[in-house]
């Protein structure tokens, strides 16, 4: 038994036929010693007397509000809730499995940007006697603060004969660092109470994995002279992180009729305009995705082909800070070839995802995982890799990126990747290895020496362990190169001579 909140206790029960249940001792919160009686809920039947009451809790009939009285006066209450465990698994009766992106997904979370603000939601078919409370933190062993509001009913839907209720909550990391590479996941814990049943649900994620930008805004069409082509332009959504030279998006532009199976024109671009072929009765739609990390696409923003008007795709209020001014040259060191670094780091992003595309959708976090991923270098908050830090002195950040590149280059050349099951030399991992080396050489010219980090002894003995470790390394490499690519894109746009 444990205390959920003041005067509310959760009894954990193994739930099977003829289970013995749990013996619970309740103590009346009073200085009085005698003449105390106990009742349950609205019943006037006296269950026992004395300052303590011992009960055997086996089923929901044994749960409820226990009250101690003296001479018709209420002294204190203790509410007992039950948390059922069947075959070693805690019950999940209150919330509905959303089955996306995988089975047993009860909580789903999304973030519109890297500000540390995110929204989680869940579904239930229960309409009454239902309460939720939400807690969150960054990391679990040494948790950093995340503040969550109250869960509210956000939507009601009819699904066949049933009504389905969607609840949501907004949370904000207390000390968010949008430009840093996350090393510890956000943990979200939802306590759900229905009548006398208690359940808890958890989700663990990195903000980068739950990013879903708002749709592009202000779609505009401009027909091209003597052509079937139309130039479509748009803007970044207001809610996306700034500056956009650092937090860049990529876009998919599509022209399609009302029916899903109709023919279409489709083009991908990193720019905020594209030329497409418009057809009568068709619409032009644009959606956005983080340019360097394969998280979710936004919803579509659309405008009909017939009108050459504009559409407000995005909504909501702005990201964090602006900044398009030119930055001064790098103090305290020679400037890298920003544009070359940008191209190579973007190639690294592509390779990191093609080396293991599914890794983004696999849940590789398990016990002890915080330790495993902390063995690799991360671009942290104080490393100067944010736009302001790059403006002040990019050398700190470049040194950190260089250390990481060397580290991962050595890891990809180690027994973890060269051992069984074997990879061929020109596999995406082989190309990734070569590109890491190429970028590190671009960053550190001859005669320039930065200290490098020691490689920890991660080498596992079993092939399956090696495979799991590869996944984890590639996973964190994807995050590392995304930050590096943002740094070089921003540098190329604002720091290049």
């Amino acid at each position: 038994i444990w205390e959920l909140k003041k005067d509310v206790y959760v009894v954990e029960l193994d739930w099977y036929p003829d289970a013995p249940g749990e013996m619970v001792v309740l103590t009346c919160d009073t200085p009085e010693e005698d003449g105390i009686t106990w009742t349950l809920d609205q019943s006037s039947e006296v269950l026992g007397s004395g300052k303590t009451l011992t009960i055997q809790v086996k089923e929901f009939g044994d749960a409820g509000q226990y009250t101690c009285h003296k001479g018709g006066e209420v002294l204190s209450h203790s509410l007992l809730l039950l948390h059922k465990k069947e075959d070693g698994i805690w019950s999940t009766d209150i919330l509905k499995d959303q089955k996306e992106p995988k089975n047993k997904t009860f909580l789903r979370c999304e973030a519109k940007n890297y500000s540390g603000r995110f929204t989680c939601w869940w579904l239930t078919t229960i309409s009454t006697d239902l309460t939720f409370s939400v807690k969150s933190s960054r990391g679990s062993s040494d948790p950093q603060g995340v503040t969550c509001g109250a869960a509210t009913l956000s939507a009601e839907r009819v699904r066949g004969d049933n009504k389905e209720y969607e609840y949501s909550v907004e949370c904000q990391e207390d000390s968010a660092c949008p430009a840093a590479e996350e090393s510890l996941p956000i943990e979200v814990m939802v306590d759900a109470v229905h009548k006398l049943k208690y359940e808890n649900y958890t989700s663990s994620f990195f903000i980068r994995d739950i990013i879903k930008p708002d749709p592009p805004k202000n779609l505009q069409l401009k027909p091209l002279k003597n052509s079937r082509q139309v130039e479509v332009s748009w803007e970044y959504p207001d809610t996306w992180s700034t500056p956009h030279s650092y937090f860049s998006l990529t876009f998919c532009v599509q022209v399609q009729g009302k029916a899903k199976r109709e023919k279409k024109d489709r083009v991908f671009t990193d720019k905020t305009s594209a030329t497409v072929i418009c057809r009568k009765n068709a619409s032009i739609s644009v959606r956005a995705q983080d340019r360097y990390y394969s998280s979710s696409w936004s919803e579509w923003a659309s405008v009909p082909c017939s009108g050459s008007g504009s559409s407000r795709g995005g909504s909501g209020s702005g990201g964090s800070g602006g900044g398009g001014s030119k930055l001064r040259a790098v103090p305290g060191g020679s400037s890298p070839a920003w544009t070359q670094c940008q191209q190579l780091s973007q190639k690294l992003c592509t390779l990191a995802w093609s080396a293991h595309p599914l890794v983004g959708h696999m849940d590789l976090r398990e016990e002890g995982d915080e330790e495993t991923t902390n063995d690799v270098p991360h671009i942290q908050c104080g490393d100067g890799c944010d736009p302001q830090g790059l403006r002040d002195n990019s050398q700190f950040c470049l040194q950190r990126i260089h250390q990481g590149l060397i580290f991962y280059e050595k890891l990809l050349g180690s027994d973890i990747f060269t051992g069984e099951p074997s990879l061929l030399p020109d596999s995406p991992v082989g190309q990734l290895h070569a590109s890491l080396l190429g970028l590190s050489q671009l960053l550190q010219p001859e005669g320039h020496h930065w200290e490098t980090q020691q490689i920890p002894s991660l080498s596992p003995s079993q092939p399956w362990q090696r495979l799991l470790l590869r996944f984890k390394i590639l996973r964190s490499l994807q995050a590392f190169v995304a930050v590096a690519a943002r740094v070089f894109a921003h540098g190329a746009a604002t720091l290049s001579p």
Partner: antibody, heavy 118, light 107 residues
């Protein structure tokens, strides 16, 4: 399944015109874009243009503008490509292809060899 | 127009080996890049679209990667039926253009 059957080989004199046909089956003719791509002997592929059978819209590669005309006959599910003022370097296999997506080529015809020789 | 350059022009590989074909665009084309295979006397067939998307019915040994200006088609373990000419094609802007092709021949 989606199928494109092209007309037979042609031999033409320089300055003449050629009209190659492409009969579609296995799908609703107006649901796919139709492209024409050619390949000179031992050479690579060269895109000529596309037509939307639904409305007759066309887009031609600048190289062929003014010399090529693409048309369709929806009653027979047939597309046509006419190339005028033929030169010897127009000797090639001409392919029609169809796709629901405008910018790449999914289903190909078997090709029609057009020889331009005096 | 966008110029597509493929390398090498000819690639000699033994059956069972891996083949890596390159395609470079004269300007950034995002992921608007498609790969085709052509055998002698046959029409080309689509292998990969939008740089890395696989086509149903195409063996899993064919994979694509890249974005921007540099792209790669990888055949993980060459089978006898894979010896052919491979073309890349950009769809970033009209006119649509192809690379000159890479001939994969038996070593």
């Amino acid at each position: 399944q989606v199928q494109l059957v092209q007309s037979g080989a042609e031999v033409k004199k320089p300055g003449a015109s050629v009209k190659v046909s492409c009969k579609a089956s296995g799908y609703t003719f107006t649901d796919y874009y139709l492209h024409w791509v050619r390949q000179a002997p031992g050479q690579g592929l060269e895109w000529m243009g596309w037509i939307d059978p639904e409305n007759g819209d066309t887009e031609y590669a600048p190289k062929f503008q003014g010399r090529v005309t693409m048309t369709t006959d929806t009653s027979t599910s047939t597309a046509y490509m006419e190339l005028r003022s033929l030169r010897s370097d127009d000797t090639a296999v001409y392919y029609c292809n169809a796709n629901k997506e405008l910018r790449y080529f999914d289903v190909w015809g078997q090709g029609t060899m057009v020889t331009v020789s005096s | 127009e966008i110029v597509m350059t493929q390398s090498p022009a000819t690639l000699s590989v033994s059956p069972g080996e891996r083949a890596t074909l390159s395609c470079r665009a004269s300007q950034s084309i995002s992921i608007n890049l498609h790969w085709y295979q052509q055998k002698p006397g046959q029409a080309p067939r689509l292998l990969i679209y939008f740089a890395s998307q696989s086509i149903s019915g195409i063996p899993a040994r064919f994979s694509g990667s890249g974005s921007g200006t540099e792209f790669t088609l990888t055949i993980s373990s060459l089978q006898s039926e894979d010896f052919a000419v491979y073309y890349c094609q950009q769809s970033n802007s009209f006119p649509l253009t192809f690379g000159g092709g890479t001939k994969v021949e038996i070593k």
